[in-house]
């Protein structure tokens, strides 16, 4: 069992996969969120709105994701366990202005494999 | 099962993979969420809306993901477990204004391999 006192937990496990959660302010209307592993972009989700308020969500890397009004969660099914890696989210805010781009806090993920369990140590 | 006192769990395991959840405010209508491992972008999901309120989701890195109205979850199927890594989400908020980009809270994920189980230790 894993306990923590933080308001937000970036990593969680579901059905053998890792869910990485990238939070953003609820006031944000249009944005791009990218998930990095080290320097590699694993997932990218862009939400924009058109002139009639229709929402366009682009997921060019075909990541499994869950989008809410204050976070984007990416689901990685078989994370590479050969070595630990640092994951972080990068946020581009298009709306409301002004345009902003920032790296969100991240975490180091190391998965120890076995047939029965995977032990995750998460330091925030 | 992984429990904690946090309002949001970032990591969880599903079917041998890791789900990393990136939360964002429910008021956010259009956004991009990126998941980083260290400085590498693993996933990026973008949600936008058109003028008739139709939603477009872009997932350029083809990550497995789940999108809700306040989070995006990415599923990593084989996270590298040779060493621990820091994961975090980066959020770009396009709508509502002003545009914002920020790194969300992250976590250190270390997976210990064995033949029997995958145990997750999470320090928040």
């Amino acid at each position: 069992e894993i306990n923590g006192s933080a308001d937000h937990r970036m990593f969680s496990f579901h059905n053998g996969g890792v869910q990485i959660s990238c939070k953003y302010p609820e006031t944000v209307q249009q944005l791009k969120m990218r998930l990095f592993r080290e320097r590699e972009v694993l997932c990218e989700l862009t939400k924009t709105k058109g002139s009639g308020n229709a929402v366009s969500i682009k997921n060019p890397m075909l990541c499994l994701y869950h989008l809410s009004n204050n976070s984007v969660s990416f689901f990685l099914n078989n994370p590479d366990s050969s070595q630990g890696s640092y994951y972080f989210c990068s946020l581009s805010i298009f709306d409301p202005p002004p345009f902003q781009e920032r790296n969100l806090s991240g975490g180091y993920l190391h998965i120890y494999e076995s047939q029965l369990c995977c032990q995750l140590k998460l330091w925030l | 099962e992984i429990n904690g006192s946090a309002d949001h769990r970032m990591f969880s395991f599903h079917n041998g993979g890791v789900q990393i959840s990136c939360k964002y405010p429910e008021t956010v209508q259009q956004l991009k969420m990126r998941l980083f491992r260290e400085r590498e972008v693993l996933c990026e999901l973008t949600k936008t809306k058109g003028s008739g309120n139709a939603v477009s989701i872009k997932n350029p890195m083809l990550c497995l993901y789940h999108l809700s109205n306040n989070s995006v979850s990415f599923f990593l199927n084989n996270p590298d477990s040779s060493q621990g890594s820091y994961y975090f989400c980066s959020l770009s908020i396009f709508d509502p204004p002003p545009f914002q980009e920020r790194n969300l809270s992250g976590g250190y994920l270390h997976i210990y391999e064995s033949q029997l189980c995958c145990q997750l230790k999470l320090w928040l």
Partner: antibody
Framework: EVQLVESGGGLVQPGGSLRLSCAAS????????MDWVRQAPGKGLVWVSN????????EYSPFVKGRFTISRDNAKNTLYLQMNSLRAEDTAVYYC??????????WGQGTLVTVSS | DIVMTQSPDSLAVSLGERATINCKSS??????????LTWYQQKPGQPPKLLIF???TRHTGVPDRFSGSGSGTDFTLTISSLQAEDVAVYYC?????????FGPGTKVDIK
């Protein structure tokens, strides 16, 4: 500098067709929704259609739905409007516009379409 | 469809004086904390130019004599001190839903 240049307008008979083009430059075209807005001579502005960043979402004004088709070629940085079954009331200056997240922040100079016999 | 109306149809104001244009929508444009209402300026022979978005936020480069206010269904564009270059037609526009619609425009001249 953002530039939008329309072309393809002209005189056409009722029932005829035209294809408008809009060449975009000075910005990452594939990052933006794009729209067509028209203005009849001496009249106000009327929204016609829009398209999302990769062309997967398109929307139309009730006045043109079923007759007009919006499309884009991101490799060519070009927006299109195929207009079929044209009517006299479609006569207008057609503007290509960039939807800048919360408003039409860039406009072309427009191309005049005249539908008359 | 949401119907946008503007008043007056036209107005003439002396240089340096205040000009006020009203816009009314047939239903509320408020969603969350944002009003999906924009204002455009169109000078003779030119395409429109974005002035104000989200009812009250000036677009980049717009002089501070232009201001927007209002919420819900009633909105106002104010030019605090009219300049010669402000002669134009001003349109309100909503992007609350589809189809987005414009008001009929208000023509501003110098008295």
């Amino acid at each position: 500098e953002v530039q939008l240049v329309e072309s393809g307008g002209g005189l056409v008979q009722p029932g005829g067709s035209l294809r408008l083009s809009c060449a975009a430059s000075g910005f990452t075209f594939s990052d933006y929704w794009m729209d067509w807005v028209r203005q009849a001579p001496g009249k106000g502005l009327v929204w016609v259609s829009n398209i999302d960043e990769d062309g997967s979402i398109t929307e139309y004004s009730p006045f043109v739905k079923g007759r007009f088709t919006i499309s884009r070629d991101n490799a060519k940085n070009t927006l299109y409007l195929q207009m079929n079954s044209l009517r006299a009331e479609d006569t207008a200056v057609y503007y290509c516009t960039r939807w800048g997240r919360f408003g039409f922040d860039s406009w072309g100079q427009g191309t005049l379409v005249t539908v008359s016999s | 469809d949401i119907v946008m109306t503007q008043s007056p149809d036209s107005l003439a104001v002396s240089l340096g004086e205040r000009a006020t244009i009203n816009c009314k929508s047939s239903q509320s444009l408020l969603s969350g904390s944002f009003n999906y209402l924009t204002w455009y300026q169109q000078k003779p022979g030119q395409p429109p130019k974005l002035l104000i978005f989200y009812a009250s936020t000036r677009h980049t480069g717009v002089p501070d004599r232009f201001s927007g206010s209002g919420s819900g269904t009633d909105f106002t564009l104010t030019i605090s001190s009219l300049q010669a270059e402000d002669v134009a037609v001003y349109y309100c526009h909503h992007h609350y839903n589809a189809p987005p619609t414009f008001g009929p425009g208000t023509k501003v001249d110098i008295k």
